[in-house]
């Protein structure tokens, strides 16, 4: 109820407070390194307010500077597993439109089983963000271990 | 002086810019895995603007989507220490009210001595966040190595 | 175009939405552990809206609470390299004015090749942030692997 009231008081859409927090749905088929995400109140604590999902990838709806953050934990993992399967790397980037394709954030697991990071980056309406996990290890689907989100910060 | 002026110009409470950054006070007694936090200008660079501390745990005062972040560094640690005492795991979750109890963010140290992460999550007035460190290792009380905070992002 | 419109609608300067995201320019000369940063649209996805660079160090222009974040990846690195060259430590702090000098955030690499973290901290106009990398290993200059930024959160 208080959420609804607050949204009446503040025209959030005009303020541009776009925000999304996603949980892992599944990995891609062979040769597709992308992680596929899902979000929505029915799924627990994930949500999309502004951005949308397009075949499991996050599409931006408002120009601006965004804080992008991610955490990925490998599913069956110990430091020896991680080092044996090295390199396992996660990259977050703009994958479409092709003209704006760029890697925004990249991390390797080395001897760890979790990576987590965040950065500020300009994004434009229509940019689709992809998260590529290279290597043979599978990410955990636990919602407290693997998640991906964006937060609009300013125009 | 500029802080005071800014607060007169912007009714921060109505905007809902609740924010807190805490430093470690101490670990719990045996069988209590919770970390106990402290905050306030007298303690250095920690603060609470909106949220409150309840027996060392952070209680939320305003509904909304929050960015939750944490860094914990182990006090006496090398990669061999960390792996010898594995699993040492940190979990951040809502611990009360019991009806809303859930793990929000979880990380293991594996061969590292520091974990750091952040995520967006909906929180409601009255939610108390607990940070549980399982394992026998002591976290550093240095304010630049171990800290925990939340930032209100939108309703 | 939409960026320009948005800026007309919202007097961002009065709102105080200062924000910066920097990429690594170079390391310092011997005996200078500081990383030197650069930012601006000509360099890719780095930018400064409010804060300024002073000889490669970030200077704050507006009092407030900021979210400070950083990721540093070592250039030629494996878990064995990292552990052999231990301790390699990154510290972010206020380095001037001298009266406000303090370490804000500190991380060691141990057996990893990347550190990433973030924290909320009060900063004042004129504060200069320095990022000190101690040890013999060189940081990667790739813009998706090494970056440093701040975001004004509230007065």
């Amino acid at each position: 109820q208080r959420f609804a009231q607050a949204q009446q008081q503040l025209p959030l859409e005009s303020l541009g407070w776009d925000v999304a927090e996603l949980q892992l749905n599944h990995t891609g088929p062979q040769q597709d390194p992308r992680l596929y995400w899902q979000g929505g109140p029915a799924l627990g604590r994930s949500f999309l307010h502004g951005p949308e999902l397009d075949k499991g990838q996050l599409r931006i709806h408002r120009d601006g500077i965004y804080m992008v953050h991610i955490q990925v934990t490998l599913a069956i993992c110990s430091s020896t597993t991680a080092s044996r399967h090295h390199p396992t790397t996660l990259a977050v980037g703009i994958c479409s439109p092709a003209s704006r394709s760029i890697s925004l954030l990249r991390l390797s697991f080395h001897q760890g089983c979790t990576i987590a990071s965040q950065r500020l980056t300009p994004l434009a309406r229509g940019d689709t963000l992809c998260t590529n996990l290279t290597g043979t290890l599978l990410p955990s689907r636990n919602t407290d271990e693997t998640f991906f989100g964006v937060q609009w910060v300013r125009p | 002086q500029r802080f005071a002026q800014a607060q007169q110009q912007l009714p921060l409470e109505s905007l809902g810019w609740d924010v807190a950054e805490l430093q470690l006070n101490h670990t719990g007694p045996q069988q209590d895995p919770r970390l106990y936090w402290q905050g306030g200008p007298a303690l250095g660079r920690s603060f609470l603007h909106g949220p409150e501390l309840d027996k060392g745990q952070l209680r939320i005062h305003r509904d909304g989507i929050y960015m939750v972040h944490i860094q914990v560094t182990l006090a006496i640690c090398s990669s061999t220490t960390a792996s010898r005492h594995h699993p040492t795991t940190l979990a951040v979750g809502i611990c009360s009210p019991a009806s809303r109890s859930i793990s929000l963010l979880r990380l293991s140290f594996h061969q590292g001595c520091t974990i750091a992460s952040q995520r967006l999550t909906p929180l409601a007035r009255g939610d108390t966040l607990c940070t549980n460190l399982t394992g026998t290792l002591l976290p550093s009380r240095n304010t630049d190595e171990t800290f925990f905070g939340v930032q209100w992002v939108r309703p | 175009q939409r960026f320009a419109q948005a800026q007309q609608q919202l007097p961002l300067e009065s709102l105080g939405w200062d924000v910066a995201e920097l990429q690594l320019n170079h390391t310092g000369p011997q005996q200078d552990p500081r990383l030197y940063w650069q930012g601006g649209p000509a360099l890719g996805r780095s930018f400064l809206h409010g804060p300024e660079l002073d000889k490669g160090q970030l200077r704050i222009h507006r009092d407030g609470i900021y979210m400070v974040h950083i990721q540093v990846t070592l250039a030629i690195c494996s878990s064995t390299t990292a552990s052999r060259h231990h301790p390699t430590t990154l510290a972010v702090g206020i380095c001037s004015p001298a009266s406000r000098s303090i370490s804000l955030l500190r991380l060691s690499f141990h057996q990893g090749c990347t550190i990433a973290s973030q924290r909320l901290t009060p900063l004042a106009r004129g504060d200069t942030l320095c990022t000190n990398l101690t040890g013999t290993l060189l940081p990667s200059r790739n813009t998706d692997e090494t970056f440093f930024g701040v975001q004004w959160v509230r007065p």
């Epitope: - | 470690l24 006070n25 101490h26 670990t27 045996q30 026998t136 240095n142 304010t143 | 000098s101 370490s103």
Partner: antibody, heavy 123, light 107 residues
Framework: QVTLKESGPVLVKPTETLTLTCTVS??????????VTWIRQPPGKALEWLAH???????SYSTSLKSRLTISKDTSKTQVVLTMTNMDPVDTATYYC???????????????WGQGTLVSVSS | DIQMTQSPSAMSASVGDRVTITCRAS??????LAWFQQKPGKVPKRLIY???SLQSGVPSRFSGSGSGTEFTLTISSLLPEDFATYYC?????????FGGGTKVEIN
């Protein structure tokens, strides 16, 4: 009342291993946040921090002496033992033990010390 | 490891003098610093903890200040019983490290 008492040989030969014991009373080493440190002082020289052990068995050693030191505590939690291998005449010093009552309370660091024990290294 | 550099290593002073001893840390140690006094043949005695907090029972002529990397121990008016050696100790990160000591001698 809190006391710490060091004991061990007065004289050791070069290349031998030194074993020192710190016996504590008036407090228990059962709290994970509590610990005992060994510190030494060669005659006429400065204090040198050697090693620390917490009740949960976490240990830290002086970097320069790490390869020669081992710190441990006995199961009764009343004794902390320091062993130092390959003794040399330069290791001649008074060896002290001191306590940290609570890692998270800086006012409790090294509030109590033992009287020290002088160890000479000579053939 | 954090290096602690204490200066001067020795000094001569007279009763009633104001004495200042400094300690510099190789990296920021916040306020995690203690000062100890040691007299010949005696156990070190803690004077100051947390950089500036006076140990109970220690006379108020002793004071500590500083934070980060620069620290000072001040004796406002030297008394005969203050002639001793003084050590700083960083308590920020394990392994802890002492400064090299400052011997305060009678002028």
């Amino acid at each position: 009342q809190v006391t710490l008492k060091e004991s061990g040989p007065v004289l050791v030969k070069p290349t031998e291993t030194l074993t020192l014991t710190c016996t504590v009373s008036g407090f228990s080493l059962s709290n994970a946040r509590m610990g005992v440190t060994w510190i030494r002082q060669p005659p006429g020289k400065a204090l040198e921090w050697l090693a620390h052990i917490f009740s949960n068995d976490e240990k830290s050693y002086s970097t320069s002496l790490k390869s020669r030191l081992t710190i441990s505590k006995d199961t009764s939690k009343t004794q902390v033992v320091l062993t130092m291998t390959n003794m040399d005449p330069v290791d001649t010093a008074t060896y002290y033990c001191a306590r940290i009552r609570d890692y998270y309370d800086i006012s409790s660091y090294y509030d109590y010390w033992g009287q020290g024990t002088l160890v000479s290294v000579s053939s | 490891d954090i290096q602690m550099t204490q200066s001067p290593s020795a000094m001569s002073a007279s009763v009633g003098d104001r004495v200042t001893i400094t300690c510099r840390a190789s990296q920021d140690i916040s306020n995690y610093l203690a000062w100890f006094q040691q007299k010949p043949g005696k156990v070190p005695k803690r004077l100051i903890y947390a950089a500036s907090s006076l140990q109970s029972g220690v006379p108020s002529r002793f004071s500590g200040s500083g934070s980060g990397t620069e620290f000072t121990l001040t004796i406002s008016s030297l008394l005969p019983e203050d002639f001793a050696t003084y050590y700083c100790l960083q308590l920020n990160s394990f392994p802890f490290t002492f400064g090299g000591g400052t011997k305060v001698e009678i002028n």
